[in-house]
């Protein structure tokens, strides 16, 4: 599914006409508030279904989210579906309306909830009150669906200023019925470490106020205990850790630490684990296959990436040619290592606009005090091919001699045709290939010379014809893996006093 | 692609009528939107009019209100402005745009443009 304009997020004028369209594989279609407004459905000739919404004489009640989905979706792979969000900022219209059992929230657990206050203004401050309080709560406020948290059983209203006018919403009542599962999240500082590194890991508990913990871990089962020390987290009402903390951690403490939580009242329990490995020192390795040999083609820009696992964060070099690298303040090379879990990095190299000079031996070393890694590849700039002469001359022996010169990497193919016809060539009749050894008309004389500087290949081709009785055209093509390049000549019979 | 080619243009005295076309090729036209947008030298591109894709919504420059018609063929592939009552002030190149994604009276909005035909209102 394609949406245009696509968003996901547009603010758009009031009074004014707006167009959205979404297109896709099958027929389309726009939802609104779970309803399909007015809309234009086409399909065009290359087989793509469109449809397009028209909202006009936009109000701040056109605020809201937009769906573009499949209209039959049964027949496809994926429920894809496309969200857009429009704010249409209208002073007239403070809180947007909400259904009435929007306006009563029920819970059975403990759990997150929203307070679905949205107006039509992304620019707006908007506050969570208490009905009976002026104290702002802190709440985190997202303009597209309200205030989200965890709320106590109260009434709830939501203030903005609009102008110099101060407007509130209807009030939000919250209800909970009663208090359910546990919720439990385990993590560790690390889950790699060194031996003689501390092993700490935190359970915690969200919206109970009684609850016993129970660990398990390696040490346990070898009878040497460790005491949890449990708290409570005074900024987060009822959120209770607790943390078991190993210091100097050896070999045998690598594997999976589980912490159980019960609470009596209800007998509700819930467990989370969590896997730590104890490493005899540190390491670095490579993972995945980096060619030996890398190319780059002349001007392009070109990335280059080594993906490792190393503990603990190594440092990263890269050298070309045994010198060290670094970020060139011209913005021809950029180098980065990026973290992409705990222990894994990507380390990236990118020359941009690659110039001839950057061909060589690049390596890339990641070290620490403990281990050390090194990959290294040839990068061979690749030069499109062009032919840069293509003369024709007739020396005393009689024959007609073509020559032909070019350059570029790797290193070119060359490619002789002759077409007879001038009137029908190239477009009726195909040319003929020449310079086959079993051809007694032309023979062929190639030499090749790799320029040490340039780090290209040059490609001297001379053709001899034996006999030309009427006008032909000579064509000389340049091939190599990153393009080719022709050039062509009338050859005329010696008897013919001009020449084309 | 879409390519636009607009015709019709052409010098009229004040008060009298043109029909600009514009017809498209290259994808299926029932899909986008069309619009004529005018220019004067060396002033910006302005709205005109414009037509949704089955011709349910036509919108129009106040200005052009009431002596301006907007209208459509998706067999033909064409969209057409009927432009009576002409004044001096319409002088102007007028460009055919197609497929709006956005608000419907800024030029940005438009993906595809014709080269524009040229009206002459003279007094």
């Known amino acids: 599914l394609v949406v245009t304009p696509p968003g996901p997020e547009l603010v758009l004028n009031v009074s004014s006409t707006f167009v959205l369209t979404c297109s896709g594989s099958a027929p389309v279609v726009w939802e609104r508030m779970s309803q399909e407004p007015p809309q234009e459905m086409a399909k065009a000739q290359d087989g793509t279904f469109s449809s397009v919404l028209t909202l006009t004489n936009l109000t701040g009640l056109d605020t809201g989210e937009y769906f573009c989905t499949h209209n039959d979706s049964r027949g496809l792979e994926t429920d894809e579906r496309k969200r857009l969000y429009i704010f249409v900022p209208d002073p007239t219209v403070g809180f947007l309306p909400n259904d009435a059992e929007e306006l009563f929230i029920f819970l059975t657990e403990i759990t997150e909830i929203t307070i679905p206050c949205r107006v039509t203004d992304p620019q707006l401050v908007v506050t969570l009150h208490e009905k009976k309080g002026d104290v702002a709560l802190p709440v985190p406020y997202d303009h597209q669906r309200g205030f989200s948290g965890i709320f106590e059983d109260r009434s709830y209203i939501c203030k903005t200023t609009i102008g110099d006018r101060e407007v509130d919403s209807d009030a939000y009542y919250v209800y909970r019925l009663q208090v359910s599962s546990i919720n439990v999240s385990v993590n560790a500082v690390q889950t790699v470490v060194r031996q003689g590194e501390n092993i700490t890991l935190m359970c915690i508990v969200i919206g109970n106020e009684v609850v016993n913990f129970e660990w398990t871990y390696p040490r346990k089962e070898s009878g040497r205990l460790v005491e949890p020390v449990t708290d409570f987290l005074l900024d987060m009402p009822y959120h209770i850790r607790s943390i078991l903390h190993i210091p100097s951690a050896e070999l045998e403490d690598s594997g999976t630490y589980t912490c159980n939580v019960t609470e009596s009242v209800n007998d509700h329990q819930d467990e989370k684990a969590i896997n730590i490995t104890v490493v005899e020192s540190g390491y670095v390795r490579l993972l995945g296959e980096v060619g030996t040999l890398q190319f780059a083609e002349l001007h392009r820009s070109r990335t280059l990436q080594v993906v490792f696992e190393a503990y603990p964060p190594p440092t990263v070099l890269w050298f070309k040619d045994n010198r060290t690298l670094g970020d060139s303040s011209a913005g021809e090379i950029a180098l980065s290592t990026r973290n992409v879990s705990e222990t894994r990095y990507v380390s990236e190299l990118t020359l941009v606009r690659v110039k001839v000079a950057e061909a060589g031996h690049y390596t890339m070393r990641a070290f620490h005090e403990d281990a050390e890694v090194q990959l290294s590849f040839q990068l061979q700039i690749n030069v499109p091919v062009r032919v840069l002469e293509l003369s024709e001359s007739h020396p005393d022996s009689g024959e007609q001699t073509v020559r032909c010169r070019g350059r570029g990497m790797p290193q070119p193919n060359i490619i002789w045709s002759a077409c007879r016809d001038l009137k029908r060539c190239p477009r009726e009749l195909p040319p003929t290939l020449l310079g086959n050894s079993s051809e007694e008309e032309s023979q062929l004389e190639t030499n090749v010379t790799y320029w040490e500087e340039e780090q290209e290949f040059e490609v001297v081709s001379t053709l001899r014809l034996q006999h030309v009785d009427r006008p032909l055209s000579v064509r000389c093509t340049l091939r190599n893996a990153v393009g080719q390049d022709t050039q062509e000549v009338i050859v005329v019979p010696h008897s013919l006093p001009f020449k084309v | 692609e879409v390519q636009l080619v607009e015709s019709g243009g052409g010098l009229v005295q004040a008060g009298g009528s043109l029909r600009l076309s514009c017809a498209a090729s290259g994808r299926a036209f029932g899909g986008p939107y069309m619009a004529w947008f005018r220019q004067t030298p060396g002033k910006g591109r302005e709205f005109v009019a414009a037509?949704?894709?089955?011709?349910?919504?036509?919108f129009y420059q106040d200005s052009v209100k009431g002596r301006f018609t907007i209208s459509r063929d998706n067999t033909k592939n064409t969209a057409y402005l009927q432009m009576n009552s002409l004044k001096p002030e319409d002088t102007a190149v007028y460009y055919c745009a197609a497929e709006a994604a956005g608000e419907v009276r800024l030029e940005t909005s438009y993906k595809y443009w014709g080269q524009g035909t040229q009206v002459t209102v003279s007094s």
């Open positions: 037509i949704s894709p089955s011709s349910v919504y036509t």
